[in-house]
C-alpha cells in the first residue's frame, strides 16, 4: 500500500484527479525525479543561446552560447560576448588591456603582469596585452658556484683528435 504519488517515476507527475494516478509529462515539460506533483516547463534555448541537449521527459534542455559568446553562471544562465585576447569586456564593449596588464583568453578581465622582482627574479620575456611576462632566473642563480642546470662537458683525453 505504498503511496502511489511518491512512487510516480521520473517523466511522470501525480495527476491523481484523473483515471490514472501517474500521467506522462506533457510535451515540452519534464520531471527529473520521482514523486513530482507537477512537471517543469522545459528550458528554451533562444536568441544568443543554442540547444546543446534537447529536453526529454526526464531531463531539462541544456543550452550553450552561439559562436562569439561564452556561458556564464550555473547551467549557462547567461551568455557574454567574447573579446579578443588582449582585451576585456566593459560596459562599452571590448577594450584593449591597459599597459601592464594582459588577458590570454577570450573572456574575463585583464590581469597585471607578474612582478618578477617580488620573487627576486629578472624579466626574461617582456609582457604583452596577450601574454604575461616570463620571469628569468634570479641574479643569485647566475653567480659563480651556483649549481648549473647544464652539466659540464666531459674533458677530452690528450693525444686524440676527432676522426
Amino acid at each position: 500500500l505504498q503511496d502511489p504519488c511518491s512512487n510516480c517515476p521520473a517523466g511522470t507527475f501525480c495527476d491523481n484527479n484523473r483515471n490514472q494516478i501517474c500521467s506522462p509529462c506533457p510535451p515540452n515539460s519534464f520531471s527529473s525525479a520521482g514523486g513530482q506533483r507537477t512537471c517543469d516547463i522545459c528550458r528554451q534555448c533562444k536568441g544568443v543561446f543554442r540547444t546543446r541537449k534537447e529536453c526529454s521527459s526526464t531531463s531539462n534542455a541544456e543550452c550553450d552560447c552561439t559562436p562569439g559568446f561564452h556561458c556564464l553562471g550555473a547551467g549557462c544562465s547567461m551568455c557574454e560576448q567574447d573579446c579578443k585576447q588582449g582585451q576585456e569586456l566593459t560596459k562599452k564593449g571590448c577594450k584593449d588591456c591597459c599597459f601592464g596588464t594582459f588577458n590570454d583568453q577570450k573572456r574575463g578581465i585583464c590581469r597585471p603582469w607578474t612582478n618578477c622582482s617580488l620573487d627576486g627574479k629578472s624579466v626574461l620575456v617582456n609582457g604583452t596585452k596577450e601574454r604575461d611576462v616570463v620571469c628569468g632566473p634570479s641574479p643569485a642563480d647566475l653567480s659563480p658556484g651556483a649549481s648549473s642546470v647544464t652539466p659540464p662537458a666531459p674533458a677530452r683525453e690528450p693525444g686524440h683528435s676527432p676522426q
Epitope: 502511489p4 512512487n7 510516480c8 494516478i21
Partner: antibody, heavy 112, light 111 residues
C-alpha cells in the same frame, strides 16, 4: 499508532461507520491512509485509500465504490462509511498508513 | 479488476532451510509498486518488502524480494521458527479504481 473503532453486529442492509484514530500522526499533513479487511479465516482484501490533508481523489476497489466511502473527518481521524451491508462484509477491518503502520482492527459482523 | 495469484497456498519447511513464494499479476504492476507482508494469527499484517525489493525497516536480510512486471518472488532463507506465518503479496496499479490488489496468501509452517 492507529486504532480502529465502530465495529459492531448489524443486520443485513444496515449502514455502519468505522473510525481510524491516529496518535502522534497529524492528518492535516499528507499521508496515504487505507482500509483493508479480512474475513474470518480468509486473506486480505483492499478496500480504499485516501490522501489526508488533500483534496485528491480517493482510490477504491471497484467492488467497494458506491457502497463504501473513505474520508478524513478531522486532523486525527479517517472514516469508512459502509452501506447496504451483507453477510459477505463480515470481517476484521484494518486501517493502515502507507502499508507500514497498521491498527489492530475492528470486527464487523453482519447477521440477521 | 487486477488478480494476484500467489503460489503455493501453503508450504512446509525445515528450520534453516529456504522457501520461495511466487506472485503473478494479471496486469503489469506499475513502477515496481509491489510489497510483501507477513501476518501472524490475531495480528495485523507487517510490511516486509516494498518497491519489489527494498527491505522495510527492522526486517532481517534473510527476506529477499525480487521480480518486476507481472512476476514477483519472496525468498526466505535460513528459516527460523518465528517465520511461521501467512505471507501476502500486494501489487499497485496506475488507476484510481482497483489501485491495489492482494494475493491469496501463503502459509509457511514447519515440519
Amino acid at each position: 499508532s492507529l486504532e480502529e473503532s465502530g465495529g459492531d453486529l448489524v443486520k443485513p442492509g444496515a449502514s455502519l461507520t468505522l473510525t481510524c484514530t491516529a496518535s502522534g500522526i497529524d492528518f492535516s499533513r499528507r499521508y496515504y491512509m487505507c482500509w483493508v479487511r479480512q474475513a474470518p479465516g480468509k486473506g486480505l482484501e483492499w478496500i480504499a485509500c485516501i490522501y489526508t490533508g488533500s483534496r485528491d481523489t480517493p482510490h477504491y476497489a471497484s467492488w467497494a465504490k458506491g457502497r463504501f466511502t473513505i474520508s478524513q473527518t478531522s486532523s486525527t481521524t479517517v472514516t469508512l462509511q459502509m452501506t447496504s451491508l451483507t453477510a459477505a462484509d463480515t470481517a476484521t477491518y484494518f486501517c493502515a498508513r502507507e502499508g507500514s503502520l497498521w491498527g489492530q482492527g475492528t470486527l464487523v459482523t453482519v447477521s440477521s | 479488476a487486477q488478480v494476484l495469484t500467489q503460489t503455493p497456498s501453503s508450504v512446509s519447511a525445515a528450520v534453516g532451510g529456504t522457501v520461495s513464494i511466487s506472485c503473478q499479476s494479471s496486469q503489469s504492476v506499475y513502477s515496481n509498486w509491489f510489497s510483501w507482508y507477513q501476518q501472524k494469527p490475531g495480528q495485523p499484517p507487517k510490511l516486509l518488502i516494498y518497491s519489489a525489493s527494498t527491505l522495510a525497516s527492522g526486517v532481517p536480510s534473510r527476506f529477499k524480494g525480487s521480480g518486476s512486471g507481472t512476476q514477483f518472488t519472496l525468498t526466505i532463507s535460513d528459516l527460523e521458527c518465528d517465520d511461521a506465518a501467512t505471507y501476502y503479496c500486494a501489487g499497485g496499479y496506475n488507476t484510481v479504481i482497483d489501485t491495489f490488489a492482494f494475493g491469496g496468501g501463503t502459509e509457511v509452517e514447519f515440519k
